[in-house]
């Protein structure tokens, strides 16, 4: 059921040529878990730089360092993956640059070609020295979290020794992992103490446990696999925009909506209005008016400019962005002050980075 009654028809028209949005795939920075990553904001003449991740303001913490035009992530984890943006705020305008961070293991899609040291993993013991299983190469087991793009090949390794030579079996989410549990099955390379899954899909997500045992004991190690889906996403709007603004009667004001979309976005600026003295229709839904939308006859749809405002222009302004995948919207309030009252510091007409949430 619609959440509003439209005063004007909002049928999607052919969108504006994509000169104002970063629609192509942004630059991708790849790091392995545990590594540090440093990215420089590729924008010039920045008075103030602010950063966002997946549309949410990014502040410094114990792993994130923001120094000037540089972003540093220490000890990256798969959770650091996402869409980042730096916004350079200048005296007259602002500009945003987007980039992707992908924290993932570079996993070979080959069949153990990278196991040049595989023979060393298979440790033979003096037959008299009976020994419970033990790990022979814990370095290869340090990365417990594996975030892998769909269709890639994944390899988990548990190099072990013991006497007699231990056996290895694998569990998925704590239960026996059977070949029929996934299309295409999987391979176990006992010589290399490895489990190989080719062409992973989202249903492969989960915890994988190797259990290595002999008659003297049992050890286990668990990996977590996250399959990163490659599919187009709905629009992302920069946090804090549009920003609340105020102006005096007769003044001018601008609202800005910064959009990232990997499918052509359609932008609408919408305002709550009154019809026949009422803000709500007979169905109880608010009346809304489309003030501007991206289209052939529309210039920069990311900016809504209001000139010579009156008290009637006060209220909530919604930036609504859609593509064929989904929608996103954020809003801001316009306060219209009497002529004699000047706007306060936090009510600048143009959006300031101070307002990034």
């Amino acid at each position: 059921r619609p959440s509003f009654s439209l005063v004007e028809d909002t049928t999607l028209e052919p969108e504006e040529p994509p000169t104002k949005y970063q629609i192509s795939q942004p630059e991708v920075y790849v790091a392995a878990p545990g590594e540090s990553l440093e990215v420089r904001c590729l924008l010039k003449d920045a008075a103030v730089i602010s950063w966002t991740k997946d549309g949410v303001h990014l502040g410094p913490n114990n792993r994130t360092v923001l120094i000037g035009e540089y972003l540093q992530i220490k000890g990256a984890t798969p959770r650091d993956s996402g869409l980042y943006a730096c916004t350079a705020s200048r005296t007259v305008d602002s500009e945003t640059w987007y980039f992707m961070v992908n924290v993932t293991d570079a996993i070979s899609s080959g069949d153990d070609e990278d196991d040049t040291d595989g023979a060393e993993d298979f440790v033979s013991e003096n037959s008299n020295n009976k020994r419970a299983p033990y790990w022979t190469n814990t370095e290869k087991m340090e990365k417990r979290l594996h975030a892998v793009p769909a269709a890639n090949t994944v390899k988990f390794r548990c190099p072990a020794g013991g006497n007699p030579m231990p056996t290895m079996r694998w569990l998925k989410n704590g239960k026996e992992f059977k070949q029929e549990h996934r299309i295409g099955g999987y391979k176990v390379r006992n010589q290399h103490w490895s489990l190989i899954m080719e062409s992973v899909v989202p249903s492969d997500k989960g915890n994988y446990t190797c259990v290595v045992e002999n008659e003297y004991g049992s050890i286990n190690h668990t990996y977590h696999l996250d399959v990163v889906e490659r599919s187009p996403h709905r629009p992302i709007l920069q946090a804090g925009l549009p920003a609340n603004a105020s102006t005096v009667v007769g003044g001018d004001v601008e609202f800005v909506c910064k959009v990232y979309s990997d499918a052509q976005p359609h932008i609408q600026w919408i305002k709550h209005v009154e019809k026949n003295g009422s803000k709500y229709g007979p169905d109880g839904l608010p009346y809304l008016k489309v003030l501007k939308h991206s289209g052939i006859n529309s210039s920069n749809a990311e900016v809504l400019a209001l000139f010579n405002v009156t008290e009637a222009d006060a209220g909530e302004y919604i930036c609504k962005v859609s593509n064929y995948i989904g929608q996103a919207n954020q809003s801001a309030w316009l306060t219209v002050l009497p002529k004699q009252q000047a706007p306060g510091r936090e009510k600048e007409i143009t959006a300031s980075p101070d307002y990034l949430e």
């Epitope: 499918a263 064929y324 989904g326 929608q327």
Partner: antibody, heavy 113, light 107 residues
């Protein structure tokens, strides 16, 4: 696991209406458009329209705007496509799709007197 | 409405062949183009979105290229399971029109 499950095949007489359902699971239902696409025998794919379940926003192919109605029930994560004033040319397989990435299995609608 | 024209309408090829299918739009669609594979009795499967991006679980032998009004789907080395009908689609503006399809058959 994202899944779209459509209702079963329908046989209708000319002039009648048909209502096809598409039940979604495995994702946040309100975050994605559900599109409807049909394919008539020996023909190509034809986009009919889309609905955004979060607020009920709809967009239609002008060819179907008068006869097609898309609705969404967020309580059951189900989208419905109703096509009225059926004619023999509407005989086709009707698909729902989440943003064209995940598709339902298809519903065959046969219009015959 | 934006018209999408695919060529060829049918194509015979052998396993291991490199195959190219083209799609033309009646106006600039700025890379807003998807490619699908459809097998008889099955729903279409998204292969490429945004003209060049490989969708989930799609083998890397599939690739997409193009800009403006001209787009191409390439299969670098045909596999037995690739014999199907392929469609391009405009996702720039509604109605989201499809090309007429290219039927890829075994030679």
């Amino acid at each position: 696991q994202v899944q779209l499950v459509q209702s079963g095949a329908e046989v209708k007489k000319p002039g009648a209406s048909v209502k096809v359902s598409c039940k979604a699971s495995g994702y946040t239902f309100t975050n994605y458009y559900i599109h409807w696409v049909r394919q008539a025998p020996g023909q190509g794919l034809e986009w009919m329209g889309a609905i955004y379940p979060d607020n009920g926003d709809t967009s239609y192919n002008q060819r179907f705007k008068v006869r097609a109605t898309l609705t969404a029930d967020t309580s059951t994560s189900t989208v419905y496509m109703e096509l009225s004033s059926l004619r023999s040319e509407d005989t086709a397989v009707y698909y729902c799709a989440r943003a064209f990435t995940y598709w339902g299995q298809g519903t065959t609608v046969t219009v015959s007197s | 409405d934006i018209q999408m024209t695919q060529s060829p309408s049918s194509l015979s090829a052998s396993v291991g062949d490199r195959v190219t299918i083209t799609c033309g739009a009646s106006e600039n669609i700025y890379g807003a183009l998807n490619w699908y594979q459809r097998k008889p009795g099955k729903a279409p499967k998204l292969l490429i979105y945004g003209a060049t991006n490989l969708a989930d679980g799609v083998p890397s032998r599939f690739s997409g290229s193009g800009s403006g009004t001209d787009y191409t789907l390439t299969i670098s080395s045909l596999q037995p399971e690739d014999f199907a009908t392929y469609y391009c689609q405009n996702v720039l503006s509604t109605p989201y029109t499809f090309g007429g399809g290219t039927k890829l058959e075994i030679k």
